[in-house]
């Protein structure tokens, strides 16, 4: 069960190429996401002639223009130029809308605003800026996990946020490990949750005009310790032709942090087993579960020598589990290969 919220990319608004010169009105405090070109090959964004860096509050990144929270100084002309040329892919002007929303505590310290300017904007009671990110109200997470509750909001004046647990002010002082309040993200983070963290968590967002609140319910599941569980049938016996690529897959489920190894069974002095009765193996890959792609063993350009038995071995503090599969490698010219087994890869 995932407790902490997934990182969601805002829908990317791509201005049409037929309207190369256009104006977009953006409300203050609103995030901006604009596309230009395709992902890695996307164009470079410029503001008033200066190229935007790939990091920072306002950034040009992988063909995207991203502004975390639109401020008055972000208004102006933006160009997107094709990589390696001066071809203009986008030409647009961002205009400041008339509602002031929340500032972002992460913003560049250089961008100061005169608080007196705020009164030129209409006052507005707090409101949720991303209610879709708050849809998950009931959280049930294993003990030890990290939980993050978010209540992204805005208003004028910029509202404050405070948290209640079971209706009482919550600062985490009685909680081992405390809590992290990230006001710029409107979030409450609790690491290594325990059963005493169960309860109703309320974010209370207030300004001079009004207040709003939202409830989350947290249950903490006590772990029943067990050794890693491997999905049945994986890795799967696989047949491949010489020169092809092979993927062996191993799905591991474990509460306690598991450690995974891919092993190839080998023969030493004509024997597959040592005097201790254990098989001779060669360790091909080893990592923790949260390493990328550790559950997949890639074999590139296989040869006859790659044929044999492969084992996925997973261990945690409670014990070990393993499952094995055989790789059969056929010669390139074998006609039965083409007829019977055209797909070299195991697919999930």
């Amino acid at each position: 069960l995932e407790a902490s919220e997934e990182v969601e990319l805002e829908p990317c608004l791509a201005p049409s190429l037929e309207q190369q010169e256009q104006e977009l009105t953006v409300a203050l405090g609103q995030p901006v996401r604009l596309c230009c070109g395709r992902a890695e090959r996307g164009g470079h964004w410029y503001k008033e002639g200066s190229r935007l860096a790939p990091a920072g509050r306002v950034r040009g990144w992988r063909g995207r223009l991203e502004i975390a929270s639109f401020l008055p100084e972000d208004a102006g002309r933006y160009l997107c130029l094709a990589r390696g040329s001066m071809i203009v892919l986008q030409n647009l002007t961002l205009i400041t809308g008339d509602s002031l929303t929340s500032s972002n505590d992460d913003e560049d310290p250089k961008s100061h605003r005169d608080p007196s300017n705020r009164h030129s904007y209409p006052q507005q009671a707090p409101y949720w800026t991303h209610p879709q990110r708050m849809e998950k109200k009931l959280h049930a997470v294993p003990a030890g996990n990290t939980v993050k509750f978010r209540c992204p909001a805005a208003g004028n004046p910029t509202p404050t946020i405070r948290w209640l647990k079971d209706g009482q002010a919550f600062h985490g002082e009685n909680r081992i490990g405390g809590i992290r309040l990230r006001h710029q993200h409107w979030s409450l983070v609790m690491e290594s949750v325990v059963p005493s963290d169960r309860g109703t968590y309320t974010c209370l967002v207030e300004n001079a005009v009004g207040s709003i609140r939202y409830n989350y319910l947290l249950d903490v599941l006590e772990r029943s310790p067990h050794r890693p569980i491997l999905q049945a049938g994986l890795p799967a016996n696989t047949t491949a032709v010489v020169g092809s690529d092979v993927e062996l897959l191993c799905k591991v489920y474990s509460d306690a942090q598991p450690h995974i190894q891919w092993l190839k069974h080998i023969v030493i002095n004509g024997s597959s087993f040592g005097a201790d009765g254990f098989p001779y193996v060669q360790v091909l890959k080893t990592a923790d579960i949260n390493s990328s792609e550790v559950e997949v063993l890639y074999l590139r350009n296989v040869s006859a020598e790659d044929a044999g038995e492969y084992t996925c071995l997973a261990g945690n503090s409670i014990g070990l589990s393993y499952q094995s599969a055989w790789l059969t490698v056929l010669p390139e010219e074998d006609p039965t290969w083409t007829a019977a087994a055209p797909e070299a890869r195991y697919t999930d």
Epitope: L1, A140, T200, L217, L221
Partner: antibody, heavy 118, light 107 residues
Framework: EVQLLESGGGLVQPGGSLRLSCAAS????????MKWVRQAPGKGLEWVSW????????EYADSVKGRFTISRDNSKNTLYLQMNSLRAEDTAVYYC???????????WGQGTLVTVSS | DIQMTQSPSSLSLSPGERATLSCRAS??????LGWYQQKPGQAPRLLIY???TRATGIPARFTGSGSGTEFSLTISSLQSEDYAIYYC?????????FGQGTRLEIK
């Protein structure tokens, strides 16, 4: 396919007790908040109680507080409602329902009728 | 506790007509509102959650809208199987509360 099957209803005298069960199948029961909702004859829906996946959190409607106890056995995929000190106004069809992560009730059982009468 | 008020309490319409059912909360419940349909002798069935998202398998003629305190359920063209009682339910805060229901009858 998600299925919820209530049982244990029947006729009981005022002041008596009953234990309702709800057998769940087709989903990982131990991950879901579960709720009991009742409906008196010819009336609307009234929430009775909910329980968290671990059983460590429970909540009751004021009308049943102190008399009803919700519990669950995750090893048996079963939800329970122990009803004591029953009153005539507890007469209703009792439904168990699964709460989605967003707290709406996405699956309901067919209900079991509890009649409290002398 | 939050109060949920549905209107009208009953509605008599012919097949093919458009039905609009209302639900009002006594205080803001954001978009944490569900709509349920109940036919005689059956359990309720979830139609809409999050004020406007149709549950799995619910026909497109059912549309939910609203946020805060005012919500509505619209059935664009009534079919014979749509005649039932409709309940709204808030799940923004505990206790969860249902409206008293709107009975939709054949005219």
């Amino acid at each position: 396919e998600v299925q919820l099957l209530e049982s244990g209803g029947g006729l009981v005298q005022p002041g008596g007790s009953l234990r309702l069960s709800c057998a769940a199948s087709g989903f990982t029961f131990s991950r879901y908040f579960m709720k009991w909702v009742r409906q008196a004859p010819g009336k609307g829906l009234e929430w009775v109680s909910w329980i968290s996946p671990s059983g460590g959190l429970t909540e009751y409607a004021d009308s049943v507080k102190g008399r009803f106890t919700i519990s669950r056995d995750n090893s048996k995929n079963t939800l329970y409602l122990q009803m004591n000190s029953l009153r005539a106004e507890d007469t209703a069809v009792y439904y168990c329902a699964r709460a989605s992560y967003g707290a709406w009730l996405d699956y309901w059982g067919q209900g079991t009728l509890v009649t409290v009468s002398s | 506790d939050i109060q949920m008020t549905q209107s009208p309490s009953s509605l008599s319409l012919s097949p093919g007509e458009r039905a609009t059912l209302s639900c009002r909360a006594s205080q803001s419940i954001n978009r944490n509102l569900g709509w349920y349909q109940q036919k005689p002798g059956q359990a309720p069935r979830l139609l809409i959650y999050g004020a406007s998202t149709r549950a799995t398998g619910i026909p497109a003629r059912f549309t939910g809208s609203g946020s805060g305190t005012e919500f509505s359920l619209t059935i664009s063209s009534l079919q014979s199987e749509d005649y039932a009682i409709y309940y709204c339910q808030q799940y923004d805060n505990w206790p969860i509360i249902f409206g008293q229901g709107t009975r939709l009858e054949i005219k």
